[in-house]
């Protein structure tokens, strides 16, 4: 909650609850690594399982720069895109070209964001303006959500509401009181 209201109308993309972010083509230095990161317990009945926790989906990592107005993050941030088909975890490929895709004939399972994290980023701005920092909301993990015929797209907004809990880590202190301040200070990566 809360982040829905904090959607940035400038150039940064902050996914809202329940959205399915795709790496936008215009993102700078957008490197996608296809890694099936989100494993799960193997199902007892691979083709008839009813337990959503036994399903898994892909978490694709990509990097992007955060921009706000004329400012850009000193370093890119890495986040996940929830992608691919949900199926029994043991049948999901571990890498591209390996394993078999499983296509459910029954209910629809959707790969959606599960948890989010907030990360503080240091922004570099033209003209030597005051150092800037902002917090961006990044997808931390994905999950499969079973949809019944009673679900529709809008109802997905209710899912994935667990509060973002950023990892601990000292972040740079943007201390400068003049427009001439050096803003080359970088943020510690999470």
């Amino acid at each position: 909650q809360g982040w829905q209201a904090f959607k940035n109308d400038a150039t940064e993309i902050i996914p809202e609850l329940g959205e399915y972010p795709e790496p936008p083509p215009e993102l700078e230095n957008n490197k996608t690594m296809n890694r099936a990161e989100n494993g799960g317990r193997p199902p007892h009945h691979p083709f008839e399982t009813k337990d959503v926790s036994e399903y898994s989906c892909r978490e694709l990592h990509f990097t992007r720069y955060v921009t706000d107005g004329p400012c850009r993050s000193a370093k890119p941030v890495t986040e996940l895109v929830c992608s691919g088909q949900c199926g029994p975890a043991r049948l999901l490929p571990n890498a591209i070209g390996r394993g078999k895709w499983w296509r459910p004939s029954g209910p629809d399972f959707r790969c959606i964001p599960d948890r989010y994290r907030a990360q503080r980023v240091q922004l570099l701005c033209p003209g030597g303006e005051a150092p800037r920092a902002r917090k961006v909301r990044l997808v931390a993990s994905c999950k499969c959500k079973r949809l019944t015929r009673f679900h529709n797209q809008s109802e997905l907004k209710d899912f994935g509401t667990e509060a973002a809990r950023p990892q601990k880590g000292r972040k740079p202190r943007p201390r400068a009181r003049s427009a001439k301040a050096n803003q080359a200070e970088l943020e510690n990566a999470y």
Epitope: G2, A5, P70, R132, K135, A164, R173, P174, R177, S178
Partner: antibody, heavy 118, light 107 residues
Framework: EVQLQQSGAELVRSGASVKLSCTAS????????MHWVKQRPEQGLEWIGW????????EYAPKFQGKATMTADTSSNTAYLQLSSLTSEDTAVYYC???????????WGQGTTVTVSS | DIVMTQSHKFMSTSVGDRVSITCKAS??????VAWYQQKPGQSPKLLIY???TRHTGVPDRFTGSGSGTDFTLTISNVQSEDLADYFC?????????FGGGTKLELK
Amino acid sequence: EVQLQQSGAELVRSGASVKLSCTASGFNIKDYFMHWVKQRPEQGLEWIGWIDPENGDTEYAPKFQGKATMTADTSSNTAYLQLSSLTSEDTAVYYCNAGQATYYFDYWGQGTTVTVSS
Amino acid sequence: DIVMTQSHKFMSTSVGDRVSITCKASQDVGTAVAWYQQKPGQSPKLLIYWASTRHTGVPDRFTGSGSGTDFTLTISNVQSEDLADYFCQQYSSYPYTFGGGTKLELK
């Protein structure tokens, strides 16, 4: 829904200190910067500073250094502003804000009126 | 400190009119300017940031423009609920500073 609930009005004696609170609901303050702004009828709005509740980083306007101290308690999702050595100049409404950024103020609390009496 | 000057303390308008509220910075602040609306007895609300970006939920009749030292908040098709105080704020350099405010009133 994003909400910032500030503590009630304060009537304090000159020379004393006061601590104002701002409790957030609908979001985690660790995920935002918390700002404080002062408003007086004739002087308008004045920025006091911001705090990053996650690690305690702060930035103060020079005018308020030594006068104001910002703290935050993430366990109670509350930000605090302590004002010391109060004078009539400190009589004002004090607003807390939550922002994604350190530089503009997305959402505001309802304000706390501080009246300093001599 | 950068001084933000709103030369008109009061501006009169009628419902349906278009009104422009101006703000001048004492030095170049690029586009690092925000606008806030404050209705009587309420706390301020963010309308515009980066001089021209509307905040979430702000009606599109509110438009911000300008860069450098001169900034304008334009309200087209003024509604009765727009009668309020409007403040500009610069965040180009510390300390962040606000304009003195412009009160929008009915003629």
